[in-house]
């Protein structure tokens, strides 16, 4: 049952959520499957029901506690298993011993807001959500700005190599509509990846004053 054609990937949001995706070619569509979490040094177990996200891929979120509670530490190892029902029993389809702080993906930054906007500049701030206090200041950010007539994929990435929850965008065009997104990544963890992009923040630069270039 546990074989190489199965891919089982999970990330920890650093607080109280482990999100998992399991994909397997030829897996039964109408079988009930779940992810089971068994920490090595905790008294709790947790399960979540895998729900289809595509033809051969399923996902679920293990909710370990209140969103801001610190449920796991850097020394924890969690045995994660994909279990699929066969009759009255559950077959192990995939298994991994998961080091949470080696497999981090934080929640997208929230509360984006325009602090100050001018004709050519805009100062934007944001907050990180459900991020562990263990990181202290060991976080980095990427930001991108959507200009008129372009796509997000074409937007150049701005890198902030420190925990800086604001940015001053410069060389903007007056009286122009823009959108802005940011994402976050801890410096810790061999398999750590970027958070999802934040919800876009729309803003408009101020029009240039007549006869002036501000």
């Amino acid at each position: 049952a546990v074989n190489g054609t199965s891919q089982f990937t999970c990330f920890y949001n650093s607080r109280a959520n482990i999100s998992c995706v399991w994909s397997q070619d030829g897996a039964l569509q109408d079988t009930s499957c779940q992810v089971h979490a068994w920490p090595d040094r905790r008294r709790w177990n947790q399960t979540c029901e895998l729900l289809p996200v595509s033809q051969a891929s399923w996902a679920c979120n293990l909710i370990l506690g209140a969103p801001d509670s610190q449920k796991l530490t850097t020394v924890d190892i969690v045995t994660l298993r994909v279990l699929c029902r066969e009759g009255v029993r559950w077959r192990v389809m995939a298994i991994q011993d998961f080091k949470p702080f080696e497999n981090l993906r934080l929640m997208a930054p929230i509360s984006l807001q325009v602090v100050h906007v001018e004709t050519h500049r805009c100062n934007i701030s944001w907050e990180i959500s459900q991020a562990s206090h263990y990181f202290e200041r060991h976080l980095e950010f990427e930001a991108r700005t959507l200009s008129p007539g372009h796509t997000w994929e074409e937007a150049p990435l701005l890198t902030l190599k420190q925990k800086q929850e604001w940015i001053c965008l410069e060389t903007l065009t007056p009286d122009t509509q823009y959108e802005f997104q940011v994402r976050v990544k801890p410096l810790q963890g061999e398999f750590t990846t970027w958070s999802p992009w934040s919800q876009p923040l729309a803003f408009r630069t101020k029009p240039a004053a007549l006869g002036k270039d501000t």
């Epitope: 049952a1 546990v2 190489g4 298993r81 029993r89 559950w90 077959r91 192990v92 991994q96």
Partner: nanobody, 117 residues
Framework: QVQLAESGGGLVQPGGSLTLSCVAS????????MAWYRQAPGKMRELVAS???????VYADSVKGRFTLSRDNTKNTVYLQMNSLKPEDTAVYRC???????????WGQGTQVTVSS
């Protein structure tokens, strides 16, 4: 019902070595994962090292580079080679096997490892 029997524990000086063995009464190829756990008095149980049926090995950070996990499928045995032992490695070491089914969790009785001068 799979039986697990550990051996190889004992008293060793700091910096010394031991090899623990875990022999299964059934085929370890039918196990989804084999692992060694340890528990020191008054401490929480912790996973030391594990190997899945597809060969993925994980080590606790505290033993990485000092301990080596291996298996011999023909002998249905899993080994834990422990080098550069430290007093904090003192614990009861227990072998664990997880089967093909969710209700198949097997434990050995454990073997005592004491690191002391």
């Amino acid at each position: 019902q799979v039986q697990l029997a550990e051996s190889g524990g004992g008293l060793v000086q700091p910096g010394g070595s031991l090899t623990l063995s875990c022999v299964a009464s059934g085929s370890i190829l039918e196990m989804s994962r084999m692992a060694w756990y340890r528990q020191a008095p008054g401490k929480m149980r912790e996973l030391v090292a594990s190997i899945t049926s597809i060969g993925s090995i994980v080590y606790a950070d505290s033993v990485k580079g000092r301990f080596t996990l291996s298996r011999d499928n023909t002998k249905n045995t899993v080994y834990l080679q422990m080098n550069s032992l430290k007093p904090e490695d003192t614990a009861v070491y227990r072998c664990n096997a997880l089967g093909t089914w969710s209700d198949e969790t097997y434990w050995g009785q454990g073997t005592q490892v004491t690191v002391s001068s």
